[in-house]
């Protein structure tokens, strides 16, 4: 059930889940100068019953200059600097994304934890597509990806995003509107992300996180 | 079955100009973006541009100065490609060409045949 | 605008035989880079994406690599339908930008 591949990459783009399904593993990743605590887990993991999902386990990790001790070393002003830019990049999250059944939310950030984040998705596992920063989107279609079993075999569905820099010789006619109502594309299958202009999601995403964090990968 | 059907061959002037329409069925015309690509006859391809089905946006190459226009019509999930001043080095095989699947330009027309000649 | 340098021009080889054909660009492309190869009086066909994934139904003698500014596309033993002209497209950076082609004869 975990997903074998890897979401598509778009060029100038990058990708988030909203929710975690249950079965998804979360790594123990620490930055640069720590480690695990010897006896912590490997992985967080998304469990839950029918009316409550959460992460069982709890990263931890300490100075790898630490030995026999879980006691957490102060960061200096510079990771200090770096963890608040964490706390700033908790995603957005919409309501009926996170609190939806058999999903958990984004996990709070741990202590000293990687700059990147290293997930194992499972099969029905969607995640959304925006435009990095400097970028808006020239092309639209349904901007996320959803992880399917398909003759035995996952794969990730392709997101119709086409991301062009802001500079670039472009026609944009007007604001993220189509031509005619796409019919073939309900509400209920759109992602949260394009009922609002481009930059109108740039800003707000912008405000609350970096390309870093919501570059995702996983193996 | 994904399919893009193109208009038929033209022979133009110089200075004239030609619409080429794609016509798309197999999947929701609004959800992929829509490219012109140009062959010359012996030569190599050029990408001349794309269009979001979506919402009109577009990107042209500067190669072609200005000279085309790719607009698309929601109503009949058409695509068209407008070139003009057209001049003897503009006659080419232009294809359109959408991506569908996992990667860029997997489905195509077959190809429509401009001659420009006085 | 990423120019995209194909080589060699043209090759000639024997069915069985391995090739590789190469592809450099201008600056860094991030591996958004597909392979295609197109027969006369065809549309071209889609082989590889993102420098080295195989797209469906592709035979398996078909492969891409690379990263950053130089590529490959090798056919591990070449058959006789293979024979064409292949392109290689970056497709990071608008405009889109081909190879000039590389055409595959048989000797």
């Known amino acids: 059930e975990l997903c074998d591949d890897d979401p598509p990459e778009i060029p100038h783009a990058t990708f988030k889940a909203m929710a975690y399904k249950e079965g998804t593993m979360l790594n123990c990743e620490c930055k640069r100068g720590f480690r695990r605590i010897k006896s912590g887990s490997l992985y967080m993991l998304c469990t839950g019953n029918s009316s409550h999902s959460s992460w069982d386990n709890q990263c931890q990790c300490t100075s790898s200059a630490t030995r026999n001790t879980t006691k957490q070393v102060t960061p200096q002003p510079e990771e200090q600097k770096e963890r608040k830019t964490t706390e700033m990049q908790s995603p957005m999250q919409p309501v009926d994304q996170a609190s939806l059944p058999g999903h958990c939310r984004e996990p709070p950030p741990w202590e000293n934890e990687a700059t990147e984040r290293i997930y194992h998705f499972v099969v029905g596992q969607m995640v959304y597509y925006q435009c990095v920063q400097g970028y808006r989107a020239l092309h639209r279609g349904p901007a996320e990806s959803v992880c399917k079993m398909t003759h035995g075999k996952t794969r990730w569905t392709q997101p119709q995003l086409i991301c062009t820099g802001e500079m670039e010789t472009s026609q944009f006619p007007g604001e993220e509107k189509p031509q005619a109502s796409p019919e073939g594309r309900p509400e209920s299958e759109t992602s949260c992300l394009v009922t609002t202009t481009d930059f109108q999601i740039q800003t707000e995403m912008a405000a609350t996180m970096e390309t870093s964090i919501f570059t995702t990968e996983y193996q | 079955e994904v399919q893009l059907v193109q208009s038929g061959a033209e022979v133009k002037k110089p200075g004239a100009t030609v619409k080429i329409s794609c016509k798309v069925s197999g999947y929701t015309f609004t959800d992929y973006a829509m490219h012109w690509v140009q062959q010359a006859p012996g030569k190599g391809l050029e990408w001349m541009g794309v269009?979001?089905?979506?919402?009109?946006?577009?990107n042209y190459n500067q190669k072609f100065k200005g000279r085309v226009t790719i607009t698309a019509d929601t109503s009949t999930d058409t695509a068209y490609m407008e070139l003009s001043s057209l001049r003897s080095e503009d006659t080419a095989v232009y294809y359109c060409?959408?991506?569908?699947?996992?990667?860029?330009?997997?489905?195509w027309g077959q190809g429509t045949l401009v001659t420009v000649s006085s | 605008d990423i120019q995209m340098t194909q080589s060699p021009s043209s090759l000639s080889a024997s069915v069985g035989d391995r090739v590789t054909i190469t592809c450099k660009a201008s600056?860094?492309?991030?591996?958004?880079l597909s392979w295609f190869q197109q027969k006369p009086g065809k549309a071209p066909k889609s082989l590889i994406y993102r420098a080295n994934r195989l797209v469906d139904g592709v035979p398996s003698r078909f492969s891409g690599s690379g990263s950053g500014t130089d590529f490959t596309l090798t056919i591990s033993s070449l058959q006789p339908e293979d024979f064409a002209t292949y392109y290689c497209?970056?497709?990071?950076?608008?405009?889109?930008?081909f190879g000039q082609g590389t055409k595959l004869e048989i000797k």
């Open positions: 497209l970056q497709y990071d950076e608008f405009p889109y930008t």
């Open positions: 600056q860094d492309i991030n591996s958004y």
């Open positions: 060409a959408t991506s569908y699947g996992n990667y860029p330009f997997d489905y």
């Open positions: 269009i979001s089905t979506y919402n009109g946006n577009t």
